[in-house]
């Protein structure tokens, strides 16, 4: 059934080429190569992909042909290692090529860079883009795959094919429209924002698998799928979890052809077994493959079955708890998580996992006690504070968001997080705090029953961005501790951090607060980022500054930018008024 139906194949590359078709094969190989060699020029990657594709075709024609029996890692790794400038461009990554599989692939994976030193993608004029699209549609779309893949080395490859399909559709439609820009730009903005979100969500899945292991990922998947498919039986959910784990393990491991193939099989299985999974899948299952897989991944939670019995009966009141636990610990805990999650679509996945962990810890202790039943009888009472903590936090933060609006809410978080972990780089603090702040507009509009799963699971994704960026250049023991101790307790760990009293304030540098006329031509978003960067630097200089002091300085700063951007001689205004602002700010903050 499902994802594991295939027999062994003489040639893996031929098998995948036939399963996926030439177009998807080429696209996935390009993504794989761009995610490994993130600095290589587009033309070099296209050349490598064409060579691999030609080779795959020879294997399709004759599976016994030379080298066709080699593993995909061997074939792709050998191809990547032919790049002439590997040592100059990638330094020690070139040492990977001296290794044998599977160590070589592991080595390439370890060198993936979450924050590659690449120029920001600048969007050309609409007419320029449309001309490029019409001149060579294939190259235009390949370039999109390449640019996204190299900047997001863990992007979920089959989903990137779906984004590329939408990207193509946008250009096909809008380049013929009367007002090309009005048609195209909102679509591109939507794709960009959805793409960033998709990349971040997948990055958390890969971090979960790579840093915390398969068991952690499976627990997450049991909880999420049980919320989504509450009518499905436990065995069905367990089967879906196993197949989904295989798909994500493959994609996170760089096995993109196998991943895309298995994801298609999983979608097929789910649609063939809708009746025993969910009543919400009908529309998804009528769509073409890429849309179908995406739709299933985003499908709304099915209605909970009526009259589900109390959880306490099987998991607390029963005298058989320890016996059932001893019979198969992980299965029993899996059933607990399934039963709890399907009854609680109003809880975040991470909360459900905290409850399951608490339950497991209690059973480990109590099942070795003299009177196990008496020992675990009150286990559900231990859940109450765990449930209330995120509920209260979300309530407080949504109130703050509604009072301040997104920009000022982000600023409040910038100050809060800079005080917690001032050693973290300013760009990372700005990026992460801005994203944390978006939780307000994303989740606070929801009714109570949807707020927690929206907010806390989103925060897990954002804090993972902080964790992966920090891992590249670790500067704070507190960040390392919160990121590595427990996947499900990352958010509570960061929430519990107080001001870092050990931090030695940064030396004042006037250059940091010197602004020029170019700020006036920036978009509103870019201008906000400039101001927020200054705010972080202010807090790093004066961690003990009060909210009132910081607000006064930021208000002055906003007025200064507005005034100089209206001035005739902008540059002179920025130079003269800027000096005054710096002096006034230093005085206001006692610097």
């Amino acid at each position: 059934r499902g994802v594991f139906r295939r027999d062994a194949h003489k040639s893996e590359v031929a098998h995948r080429f036939k399963d996926l078709g030439e177009e998807n094969f080429k696209a996935l190989v390009l993504i794989a190569f761009a995610q490994y060699l993130q600095q290589c020029p587009f033309e070099d990657h296209v050349k490598l992909v064409n060579e691999v594709t030609e080779f795959a075709k020879t294997c399709v024609a004759d599976e016994s042909a030379e080298n066709c029996d080699k593993s995909l890692h061997t074939l792709f790794g050998d191809k990547l290692c032919t790049v002439a400038t590997l040592r100059e461009t990638y330094g020690e990554m070139a040492d990977c090529c001296a290794k044998q599989e599977p160590e070589r692939n592991e080595c390439f994976l370890q060198h993936k860079d979450d924050n590659p030193n690449l120029p920001r993608l600048v969007r050309p004029e609409v007419d320029v883009m449309c001309t490029a699209f019409h001149d060579n549609e294939e190259t235009f779309l390949k370039k999109y795959l390449y640019e996204i893949a190299r900047r997001h080395p863990y992007f979920y490859a089959p989903e990137l094919l779906f984004f590329a399909k939408r990207y193509k559709a946008a250009f096909t439609e809008c380049c013929q429209a009367a007002d090309k820009a009005a048609c195209l730009l909102p679509k591109l903005d939507e794709l960009r924002d959805e793409g960033k979100a998709s990349s971040a969500k997948q990055r958390l899945k890969c971090a979960s698998l790579q840093k915390f292991g398969e068991r952690a990922f499976k627990a997450w998947a049991v909880a999420r799928l049980s919320q989504r498919f509450p009518k499905a039986e436990f065995a069905e959910v367990s089967k879906l979890v196993t197949d989904l784990t295989k798909v994500h393990t493959e994609c996170c491991h760089g096995d993109l052809l196998e991943c895309a193939d298995d994801r298609a099989d999983l979608a097929k299985y789910i649609c063939e077994n809708q009746d025993s999974i969910s009543s919400k899948l009908k529309e998804c299952c009528e769509k073409p493959l890429l849309e179908k897989s995406h739709c299933i991944a985003e499908v709304e939670n099915d209605e909970m079955p009526a009259d589900l019995p109390s959880l306490a009966a099987d998991f607390v009141e029963s005298k058989d708890v320890c016996k059932n636990y001893a019979e198969a610990k992980d299965v029993f805990l899996g059933m607990f998580l399934y039963e709890y999650a399907r009854r609680h679509p109003d809880y975040s996945v991470v909360l459900l996992l905290r409850l399951a962990k608490t339950y497991e810890t209690t059973l480990e202790k109590c099942c070795a006690a003299a009177d196990p039943h008496e020992c675990y009888a009150k286990v559900f009472d231990e859940f109450k504070p765990l449930v209330e903590e995120p509920q209260n936090l979300i309530k407080q933060n949504c109130e703050l968001f509604e009072q301040l609006g997104e920009y000022k809410f982000q600023n409040a978080l910038l100050v809060r997080y800079t005080k917690k972990v001032p050693q973290v780089s300013t760009p990372t603090l700005v990026e992460v705090s801005r994203n944390l702040g978006k939780v307000g507009s994303k989740c606070c509009k929801h009714p109570e029953a949807k707020r927690m799963p929206c907010a806390e699971d989103y925060l897990s994704v954002v804090l993972n961005q902080l964790c992966v960026l920090h891992e590249k250049t670790p500067v704070s023991d507190r960040v390392t501790k919160c990121c590595t101790e427990s996947l499900v307790n990352r958010r509570p760990c960061f929430s519990a951090l107080e001001v870092d009293e050990t931090y030695v304030p940064k030396e004042f540098n006037a250059e940091t607060f010197t602004f020029h006329a170019d700020i006036c031509t920036l978009s509103e978003k870019e201008r906000q980022i400039k101001k927020q960067t200054a705010l972080v630097e202010l807090v790093k200089h004066k961690p003990k500054a009060t909210k009132e002091q910081l607000k006064a300085v930021m208000d002055d700063f906003a007025a200064f930018v507005e005034k100089c951007c209206k001035a005739d001689d902008k540059e002179t205004c920025f130079a003269e008024e800027g000096k005054k602002l710096v002096a006034a700010s230093q005085a206001a903050l006692g610097l």
Epitope: R1, S238, T242, K323, A326, E327, A328, V331, A368
Partner: antibody
Framework: EVQLVQSGAEVKKPGESLKISCKGS????????IGWVRQVPGRGLEWLAI????????RYSPSFEGQVTISADKSISTAYLQWSSLKASDTAMYYC????????????WGQGTLVTVSS | QSALTQPASVSGSPGQSITISCSGI?????????VSWYQQYPGKAPKLIIY???KRPSGVSNRFSGSKSGNTASLTISGLQADDEAEYSC???????????FGGGTQLTVL
């Protein structure tokens, strides 16, 4: 130190009854399932039955349901396997095992009891 | 008739690697990695060498490793030694309220 000590070898005639034992020590006997495994000479291992000494709940492999009885006395940390009427085909080595975390994982084993049934 | 299928015998020379397969694992056992491997010398009790598909009990050599793909588990022994010659059996969880199942056993011969 965890130990499972089984009773000695038995030679019996067809139709006779028999009860062999497995005494556990060095751990909380009531908190782990105990399983009995059969090995006919020259053949593989077979799970016969399991018991949870905490409440004496039992499970039997379909092939052995009604052929053997598993029991336990938690007061003396001992599990038993018994036959009411032995057959020549019951000739085998019988092992008991402590099952840890899941009933397919025997982490400690008895030394084995050889049962020979012959007329 | 075993619910799990293993090859009756495998052989290898000292220093080589061998792999023994065990197919027919139930979906639930596969989902929760509930597969164990045992080594047994003639006249001796079985010894647990792998549990939960890939984990080794303390004291077991790291030359023994386990893996799983679909409904088939595998035991790999690398750097084969003469004293690896023994019978190897897999066992898997068979579902709630059920007794576990064994494979038929595989006799490993070191040439």
């Amino acid at each position: 130190e965890v130990q499972l000590v089984q009773s000695g070898a038995e030679v019996k005639k067809p139709g006779e009854s028999l009860k062999i034992s497995c005494k556990g020590s060095g751990y909380s006997f009531t908190n782990y399932w105990i399983g009995w495994v059969r090995q006919v000479p020259g053949r593989g291992l077979e799970w016969l039955a399991i018991i949870y000494p905490g409440d004496s709940d039992t499970r039997y492999s379909p092939s052995f349901e009604g052929q053997v009885t598993i029991s336990a006395d938690k007061s003396i940390s001992t599990a038993y396997l018994q036959w009411s009427s032995l057959k020549a085909s019951d000739t085998a080595m019988y092992y008991c095992a402590r099952l840890h975390g899941v009933v397919s994982r025997g982490d400690y084993w008895g030394q084995g009891t050889l049962v020979t049934v012959s007329s | 008739q075993s619910a799990l299928t293993q090859p009756a015998s495998v052989s290898g020379s000292p220093g080589q690697s061998i792999t023994i397969s065990c197919s027919g694992i139930s979906s639930l056992a596969g989902s929760y990695n509930l597969v164990s491997w045992y080594q047994q010398y003639p006249g001796k009790a079985p010894k647990l060498i792998i549990y939960e598909v890939t984990k080794r009990p303390s004291g077991v050599s790291n030359r023994f490793s386990g893996s799983k793909s679909g409904n088939t588990a595998s035991l790999t022994i690398s750097g084969l030694q003469a004293d690896d010659e023994a019978e190897y059996s897999c066992s898997s969880y068979a579902g709630r309220n059920a007794v576990a199942v064994f494979g038929g056993g595989t006799q490993l011969t070191v040439l």
